[in-house]
Amino acid sequence: APTSSSTKKTQLQLEHLLLDLQMILNGINNYKNPKLTRMLTFKFYMPKKATELKHLQCLEEELKPLEEVLNLAQSKNFHLRPRDLISNINVIVLELKGSETTFMCEYADETATIVEFLNRWITFCQSIISTLT
């Protein structure tokens, strides 16, 4: 069956979000110690559940801490300045979850490193893209 235009738009937005998150992860994985070691000391909150677009609220709430860690890195590995990268992500997240959402994010008890955090959200995006295909 043909995919609806709204579904295609959602897929493209998720692809864009994935691209930005993978860019960050790639940039981080390119670091040589001790910068990476220092970045891994920062803790991020993980969603208790992330299976629907509304759960992107949990990602949105962690974008400021993410920007702060990326600023600390001061690296050219990200292709864009951290502020622009996070701005891109924020715009896409708002479009995907809807600005009217009043969803209250529930976080897991355990915090995560920046690498674990990014992996979680990349997995989330890929999973939803797959279900929409």
Partner: nanobody, 118 residues
Framework: QVQLLESGGGLVQTGGSLRLSCATS????????MGWYRQAPGKQRELVAV???????NYADSVKGRFTISRDNSKDTMYLQMNSLRAEDTAVYYC????????????WGQGTLVTVSS
């Protein structure tokens, strides 16, 4: 060292056409999701077109009906055919290739400049 190499950019008149190519090494071609995004000065980066490993395509509304993304598996190359070009299509165009499973490796090229003059 894995590389993606874009070519085909240049100066074109409004309404004209260009075909961008993205040559890759085979290790990052088959099965990977690939696409084109563009960056114009002072503007948000825009994802223009995507093609999955299975050949499914998707386009930004701004280029739908004018741009066509395709991939040639025998040449490990991806293309972006751009028709009916407009001044607002002026940007640096980057191709990328990404893994769809962990460790989520991402590769992108150096970019090729497309200038559409009126």
């Amino acid at each position: 060292q894995v590389q993606l190499l874009e070519s085909g950019g240049g100066l074109v008149q409004t309404g004209g056409s260009l075909r961008l190519s993205c040559a890759t090494s085979g290790t990052i071609f088959s099965g990977y999701t690939m696409g084109w995004y563009r960056q114009a000065p002072g503007k948000q980066r825009e994802l223009v077109a995507v093609i999955s490993g299975g050949g499914d395509t998707n386009y930004a509304d701004s280029v739908k009906g004018r741009f066509t993304i395709s991939r040639d598996n025998s040449k490990d190359t991806m293309y972006l055919q751009m028709n009916s070009l407009r001044a607002e299509d002026t940007a640096v165009y980057y191709c990328y290739s990404r893994e769809v499973t962990p460790p989520w490796k991402l590769y992108w090229g150096q970019g090729t400049l497309v200038t559409v003059s009126s």
